[in-house]
Interface confidence: medium
């Protein structure tokens, strides 16, 4: 629908509270270094302007696009050039180039201080003193650190954040009530951010067709009773929502997401029997619930796929008439029958089917040529099955921490040029696949594991893209979205790598390690492990294990010592010498 004033339309649709929250998220995701107070001032100015447009849609500037209005506002920031450097050049451009320019300058790894959680009493006081500012600060801090966070979902997180403080700041034991809730929100938030980052990468790097294929496969698994045309409708609408959010059009995105949730709930009879509970919830909870809803049961007596897609004499005719719709039908039919497959596997199968038809429909005897196409699927299915089986066995044998260490060594040897913090972060996340997925029965392991690995490897890809250092990473990240994981799995030790010079400073530790949380201590040890492998890429598992065991013993000993700092200095030198000898450095 054409509206005289887009800003008035969105303000009326979303309401003032959501409008202000979404504009704050949008601004914080674009100008990630700006102080909170500056953003709040800009948001208030935009909101006051929006209200004048609601009162009179014909008022001056009310007919301007949201990109024009928001971009003009961002470009009033006085310190733009000093703070953001070349990003200030965006302001010399006209829309839509200016918005594209802002998008290109979003930083996945902004140089911002780690968020330190204050004491519970301090947080509760701040919450009671000014609830609105406290919650805005939460939106701001998350949005600037996660510039692709799914904005309508961040509103849902903020709602839960508020609920946690409302409940726990009145509790007898505030900390016991609040801290687990905050931990859960933090972990879920990181996962949500990473999942959305993959959706945006899919759209931006591989195009709408790639995203739609992913959505057809996932929604067909989730809603196997829905007709193909219904799934296609949902895919089209979902693609619009994510295109908008990934493009910084957060007001449109939130509005369209609400419309999609409304449509799904009004048509749940033709979509899924699992939606009833979701559809009884308020809007933010409803949308989140729908996005996470379990797969519906598969319809009984689904016929064999071979009849329509291999045996039929009309395969090439159907394919030629409308390739994408026919391939979409193939993907839909395959996915609804296989909730036990990962989405990326389903997409590999569809790609194989497409490649076969491209070749065979031009052949002298097409049917003879594509008759065995389903046989080509077998190795593609077995590869992730075997990999998951092996890695789950390893995880069960080692436990999460040591499993992460095994992956750290494996990935450092594959791509040693990648920065140590990135290797640690990515390998730790890869290692979490064990506790996340290996507990599941066989039928749920692959969709859990391989689709999770796609999300984690995308983190590696976006971090590496900012500062490319490895041709192998670039190749695996850019050649094929669905083959990223097999590409990284297939990498062997990089024989071209020149080992890093030994630097004793890297292996010098201090008493502050003793006061760290268990997680932080693990990260310190894992950082040292990556550095060891970079110095000695040919070190055996046994050698590395011996050094790491010595290192753990050294930390434990010195943390128990009376004079910790002296212990770390003296014992540390001995450890470095012993390690050098053990590894032949």
């Amino acid at each position: 629908d054409a509206h005289k004033s887009e800003v008035a339309h969105r303000f009326k649709d979303l309401g003032e509270e959501n409008f202000k929250a979404l504009v704050l998220i949008a601004f914080a995701q674009y100008l990630q270094q700006c102080p909170f107070e500056d953003h709040v001032k800009l948001v208030n100015e935009v909101t006051e302007f929006a209200k004048t447009c609601v009162a009179d849609e014909s008022a001056e500037n009310c007919d301007k696009s949201l990109h024009t209005l928001f971009g003009d506002k961002l470009c009033t920031v006085a310190t733009l050039r000093e703070t953001y450097g070349e990003m200030a050049d965006c302001c010399a451009k006209q829309e839509p180039e200016r918005n594209e320019c802002f998008l290109q300058h979003k930083d996945d790894n902004p140089n911002l201080p780690r968020l330190v959680r204050p004491e519970v009493d301090v947080m509760c006081t701040a919450f009671h003193d000014n609830e609105e500012t406290f919650l805005k600060k939460y939106l701001y801090e998350i949005a600037r650190r996660h510039p692709y966070f799914y904005a309508p979902e961040l509103l849902f997180f903020a709602k839960r954040y508020k609920a946690a403080f409302t409940e726990c700041c009145q509790a007898a034991d505030k900390a016991a009530c609040l801290l687990p809730k905050l931990d859960e929100l933090r972990d879920e938030g990181k996962a949500s951010s990473a999942k959305q980052r993959l959706k945006c990468a899919s759209l931006q790097k591989f195009g709408e067709r790639a995203f739609k294929a992913w959505a057809v496969a996932r929604l067909s698994q989730r809603f196997p009773k829905a007709e193909f045309a219904e799934v296609s409708k949902l895919v089209t609408d979902l693609t619009k929502v994510h295109t908008e959010c990934c493009h910084g059009d957060l007001l449109e995105c939130a509005d369209d997401r609400a419309d999609l949730a409304k449509y799904i709930c009004e048509n749940q009879d033709s979509i899924s029997s699992k939606l009833k509970e979701c559809c009884e919830k308020p809007l933010l909870e409803k949308s989140h619930c729908i996005a996470e809803v379990e797969n519906d049961e598969m319809p009984a007596d689904l016929p064999s796929l071979a009849a329509d897609f291999v045996e039929s004499k009309d395969v090439c005719k159907n394919y030629a008439e409308a390739k994408d719709v026919f391939l979409g039908m193939f993907l839909y039919e395959y996915a609804r029958r296989h909730p036990d497959y990962s989405v990326v596997l389903l997409l590999r199968l569809a790609k194989t089917y497409e490649t076969t038809l491209e070749k065979c429909c031009a052949a002298a005897d097409p049917h003879e040529c594509y008759a065995k196409v389903f046989d080509e699927f077998k190795p593609l299915v077995e590869e992730p099955q075997n990999l998951i089986k092996q890695n789950c066995e390893l995880f069960e044998q080692l436990g999460e921490y040591k499993f992460q260490n095994a992956l750290l060594v494996r990935y450092t040897k594959k791509v040693p040029q990648v920065s140590t913090p990135t290797l640690v972060e990515v390998s730790r996340n890869l290692g979490k696949v064990g506790s996340k997925c290996c507990k599941h029965p066989e039928a749920k392991r692959m969709p859990c594991a391989e689709d999770y690995l796609s999300v984690v490897l995308n983190q590696l890809c976006v971090l590496h893209e900012k500062t490319p250092v490895s041709d192998r990473v670039t190749k695996c990240c850019t050649e094929s979205l669905v083959n990223r994981r097999p590409c990284f799995s297939a990498l062997e030790v990089d024989e071209t790598y020149v080992p890093k010079e030994f630097n004793a400073e890297t292996f010098t530790f201090h008493a502050d390690i003793c006061t760290l949380s268990e997680k932080e201590r693990q990260i310190k040890k894992q950082t040292a492990l990556v550095e060891l492998v970079k110095h000695k890429p040919k070190a055996t598992k046994e050698q590395l294990k011996a050094v790491m065991d010595d290192f753990a013993a050294f930390v434990e000993k010195c943390c128990k010592a009376d004079d910790k700092e002296t212990c770390f200095a003296e014992e540390g030198k001995k450890l470095v010498a012993a390690s050098q000898a053990a590894l032949g450095l």
Epitope: F228, K233, P303, D308, N318
Partner: nanobody, 119 residues
Framework: EVQLLESGGGVVQPGGSLRLSCAAS????????MLWVRQAPGKGLEWVSV????????YYADSVKGRFTISRDNSKNTLYLQMNSLRAEDTAVYYC????????????WGQGTLVTVQS
């Protein structure tokens, strides 16, 4: 009983336009995706366009993309096909059908309306 009744066919010159209609009854039209298919003389069936029950999305065969527009009016239980820039190869009997639940099989058909494009 499901009934689909097409109309609007006729003879038209190349480059000309026609608008086909399909009146539906006997089923819940507003919850059914619909499509147009055609059969040229001596040829097999070719699907032309699909429209979702809500009106979006729509899909078109590559051969008609940019020239044909499918639409529907759920309040009138009617499906439409606006055909512009007609070519000789568009000559066929046009049928409206209820979109298949999943496989490439069509449950319900109309009797068809003939479109002839000739100079």
């Amino acid at each position: 009983e499901v009934q689909l009744l097409e109309s609007g066919g006729g003879v038209v010159q190349p480059g000309g336009s026609l608008r086909l209609s399909c009146a539906a009854s006997g089923f819940t039209f507003d919850t059914s995706s619909m499509l147009w298919v055609r059969q040229a003389p001596g040829k097999g069936l070719e699907w032309v366009s699909v429209i979702h029950q809500s009106g979006t999305p729509t899909y078109y065969a590559d051969s008609v993309k940019g020239r044909f527009t499918i639409s529907r009016d759920n309040s009138k239980n009617t499906l439409y096909l606006q055909m512009n820039s007609l070519r000789a190869e568009d000559t066929a009997v046009y049928y409206c059908a209820k979109f298949p639940s999943s496989r490439m099989k069509f449950d319900y058909w109309g009797q068809g309306t003939l479109v002839t494009v000739q100079s």
